[in-house]
């Protein structure tokens, strides 16, 4: 997680702060949403379990031309230990349901807030 320092503050960021930043960004996306997020683009739903950060990134990275989630994509890359590129689905164990990006963000936010409240920062 030390690489997360690049986008928000100089030097390494504690895991709790890194998760805070991601939650803040997702809250901002959900609260500032006017038109359909990313023009209603659909992404693969993910299991919010182990490998969730990489899975979330693999799903969202296939949405292009959507500036609203670019910061989220960068943040998720800081939580994922391997490089993720479009079309890569190594962490997406199940690919059977597609949902709108807006719903994906809401589901991810709820889960991350629970992890934060539980003190699970890694």
């Amino acid at each position: 997680l030390t690489c997360l320092g690049g986008f928000a503050s100089p030097g390494p960021v504690p895991p709790s702060t890194a998760l805070r930043e991601l939650i803040e960004e997702l809250v901002n996306i959900t609260q500032n949403q006017k038109a359909p997020l990313c023009n209603g683009s659909m992404v693969w739903s993910i299991n919010l379990t182990a490998g969730m950060y990489c899975a979330a990134l693999e799903s969202l990275i296939n949405v292009s031309g959507c500036s609203a989630i670019e910061k989220t994509q960068r943040m998720l890359s800081g939580f994922c230990p391997h490089k993720v590129s479009a079309g890569q689905f190594s962490s997406l164990h199940v690919r059977d349901t597609k949902i709108e990006v807006a719903q994906f963000v809401k589901d991810l936010l709820l889960h991350l807030k629970k992890l934060f409240r539980e003190g699970q920062f890694n």
Epitope: S9, P14, S16, T17, R20, E21, I23, E24, V27, Q31, K113, K114, F116, R117, E118, G119
Partner: antibody
Framework: EVTLRESGPGLVKPTQTLTLTCTLY??????????VDWIRQPPGKGLEWLAH???????RYNPALKSRLTISKDTSKNQVVLKLTSVDPVDTATYYC???????????????WGQGTLVTVSS | DIQMTQSPSSLSASVGDRVTISCRAS??????LNWYQQKPGKAPKLLIF???KLHSGVPSRFSGSGSGTDYTLTISSLQPEDIATYYC?????????FGGGTKVEIK
Amino acid sequence: EVTLRESGPGLVKPTQTLTLTCTLYGFSLSTSDMGVDWIRQPPGKGLEWLAHIWWDDVKRYNPALKSRLTISKDTSKNQVVLKLTSVDPVDTATYYCARTVSSGYIYYAMDYWGQGTLVTVSS
Amino acid sequence: DIQMTQSPSSLSASVGDRVTISCRASQDIRNYLNWYQQKPGKAPKLLIFYTSKLHSGVPSRFSGSGSGTDYTLTISSLQPEDIATYYCQQGLTPPLTFGGGTKVEIK
């Protein structure tokens, strides 16, 4: 109107277990985003956070006291209970419960407090 | 744990004076800083959350500012009813920690 009311024994003997109850009015701990904290204040001193519990039963404790603390909730009675084991005279304090809300950013700000209950630990 | 240091520990000012209380965190708390007012014999009351957001019903003479590790509570014009002890509290992450308090008295 949101109010919280603490109740406790007043006097506890050293080594005993202290049980405190916080009754909630004007809001429910079964409602999403609601949480309750316990804080204590020794006479003439500052505030010390003890523990909190969320609507979904997520619990967190002050690491310095974690081995002695247990927080629980009874949603049907709209109450939160805090137990502190093996009490000592240094645990003498006014014990407060307070509400916190986690909607949007999780601010961990306690927006409504009970009036507090004074607990004296003495033989 | 995040340590919170308040200064001064006490101050005396005249009615109408501008009063400032400082709070320093041992690490960057990203504006997750809350202020409480505690009058003698009473429970604390939330004044300000997230550095500068006024809690409902709090007079506008109270304001908060700061970022990173340094935060300030300002009373723009001290009133007799403001006699109290003021505490800062970090809300970045548990364990939640409070400053030692600042006792405000009227000259």
